[in-house]
Structure formats: C-alpha cells, structure tokens
Amino acid sequence: KAMHVAQPAVVLASSRGIASFVCEYASPGKATEVRVTVLRQADSQVTEVCAATYMMGNELTFLDDSICTGTSSGNQVNLTIQGLRAMDTGLYICKVELMYPPPYYLGIGNGTQIYVIDPEPCPDSDF
C-alpha cells in the first residue's frame, strides 16, 4: 500500500514572484487528516518552506506569516508560494502525510523546479 505523490516537473513564477502548482496524492487509506509540507532543495540544502495540516473537505490553513496559501479538493492540493525572488529558484518538493486515522502513510513527490526571474527595473523616463 504505497502512497504516490505527483507534482509538475517545472513551474515558472510570475513577474510578481508568485508560483502555483498542484500536488496530487493517491491515498491508500481513507484519511480524514492530512499534512502537506513544501520542502525546498537547493545545493544539497533542505529547508521547510511551509506546512499545513487539514481535515479532508476543509481548507488548508497555513500559519499567518507563511508565504504559502492553498486549497484542497479531494486528493489534490493547489499550492501557491508568494514573495519569490531569483535567489529562491530551486526544487520544491511536496511531502504528504496521512495523519489520521492510523495507519500513517508517507508520500514524497519528485519535486517541482520553480524558476524565478526578478523583473527588470523600469527605466527612468524624462518627459
């Protein structure tokens, strides 16, 4: 009973530094509580970007100071990461944990490479 997690291979952030992608998991059991964590891997360093635990059928609730927002629909989570800059380019990995009821299941996606390009500053214009 494995849990497979799928996410897009590549996403390009918008000029405003916003990137969205879907994290989809194939649940081996009937979970009522799920935890989704986004991990960023760059230069063999791993950092937790954000995490949220949600009840099936309810909205994801990230911490107030989180750079992530999200919505859930069945076994799909739509994740949005904001405030991205060029230095944040990297592999963003979706980790899904079925928390309740037991048994616990773990699933980790292959990662979404998010490319962030800082916008060119507007040239000064003389009129």
């Epitope: 009973k1 791993v46 937790e48 616990y104 773990l106």
Partner: antibody, heavy 119, light 108 residues
C-alpha cells in the same frame, strides 16, 4: 547542535507506572515528529510511539497500545511517555528520537534511559 | 505490518574488506522509505542512510545504500576498525515503523 536528553527510568514492579521525559534542544521542536524507540537487553530495536508536530496525532505499536501514552509540551521542548500497567517484557532502554525531514526515520537519538520491570 | 529480515545474522570480516548486508521486506517498501543504522555496544543507534541510498550528515562515503521494493543492501566498501558494530534497517513508509533484527559485523 541537536540534543535529546531522557530521564525518568528506573526499577518498577509489574503493574505499576512510570513516566519518561525527553528534553530537546538545538532545533524547532514543533516542526518534527518525536518518537520513543526501545531496546530490550541483548535484543534489537522496537519502535514504541510517535507524537506528531503539534501534538494532536499519536500512533502506537500494538505491544503498548492502551497502556502507554505519548505526549509533548512544545512550549517546554519536552516529550513524555506515560507507561502504565508495566510488564516484565517492557524492560528495555528507552530512546527518544527525532523524526527526519524526509519522513519518520530517526536522525537524532538521546542516550537512552533504562526501565526495569521486576518484582 | 511490514516485517524486515536481515542477513546474514553475523558477518565475520577483516579490516579493509568489503561488507555487504541485506535487508528484505515482507511487502514492498513504498518509494524506498528505508533507513540503515549503526549501533555500538552501550551507545544509541546512529543514522547512516535514509531513502535507501542517501547518506546522513557526516557519514563517510565508504557507506552506501541501494535497492528498492523488497530488497535493500548496505555496503561498506572498506571496513575500518570503528565499523565493527550491529547494523539495523528500518522502514518508514507506513506505521507501525519496523526494524530488522540486525546484522552483527565482527572482526574475523
């Protein structure tokens, strides 16, 4: 650096209770699942219980279900194991261990505390 | 519950030799969620490998892990005197999280 320090072990009679504590430092405690793993004298490792993240979800090995209760106080960076109705077969070194970033393997371990159940 | 079996039970080798330890699961370990630990007498276990093949922080590159599905291997390319210990595998894809019975690597 990450440190886990267990306490509370000792000799106890069958049927009695004992509470173990594990004080953690060097990391954001609430971001990790915290586990108890035990090892009977001369035997292998056995996972006992986990308390996940905010403390609301707990999972147990069948061998301790209904007798042991795992809990945590994130404000004190402390993990607990309340052990009731102790049996001779619960005699072991009890380790506190931190779950890994990529899942519930155990990347840091305490030094262990010995629990001996004997009359 | 996933049952893990390790072989051999004891491996008698000399320093400098190659050690190959096996861990077999009773059912497929999803996405290679398998870890290896080293334990020396009187000490807590130490994480060596997670995700079947990723070395933990500070682990020398003579330790390597491989495998998927139900068959996993820990290889120590050249045994150093400090490598003689007991080695355990553990699956963490689903609860209960289970360990193998261990393989003791001792000096021949």
């Amino acid at each position: 650096q990450v440190q886990l320090v267990e306490s509370g072990g000792g000799v106890v009679q069958p049927g009695r209770s004992l509470r173990l504590s594990c004080i953690a430092s060097g990391f954001t405690f609430s971001s990790y699942g915290m586990h108890w793993v035990r090892q009977a004298p001369g035997k292998g490792l056995e996972w006992v219980a986990v308390n996940w993240y905010d403390g609301s979800n707990k999972h147990y090995a069948d061998s301790v279900k209904g007798r042991f209760t795992i809990s945590r106080d994130n404000s004190k960076n402390t993990l607990y194991l309340q052990m009731n109705s102790l049996r001779a077969e619960d005699t072991a070194v009890y380790y506190c261990a931190r779950g890994g970033v990529w899942g519930p393997y155990f990347d840091y371990w305490g030094q262990g505390t010995l629990v001996t159940v004997s009359s | 519950e996933i049952v893990l079996t390790q072989s051999p039970g004891t491996l008698s080798l000399s320093p400098g030799e190659r050690a190959t330890l096996s861990c077999r699961a009773s059912q497929s370990v999803s996405s290679s969620y398998l870890a290896w630990y080293q334990q020396k007498p009187g000490q807590a276990p130490r994480l060596l490998i997670y995700g079947a093949s990723s070395r933990a922080t500070g682990i020398p590159d003579r330790f390597s892990g491989s495998g998927s599905g139900t068959d996993f291997t820990l290889t120590i390319s050249r045994l150093e005197p400090e490598d003689f210990a007991v080695y355990y595998c553990q699956q963490y894809g689903s609860s209960p999280f289970t360990f193998g019975p261990g393989t003791k690597v001792d000096i021949k």
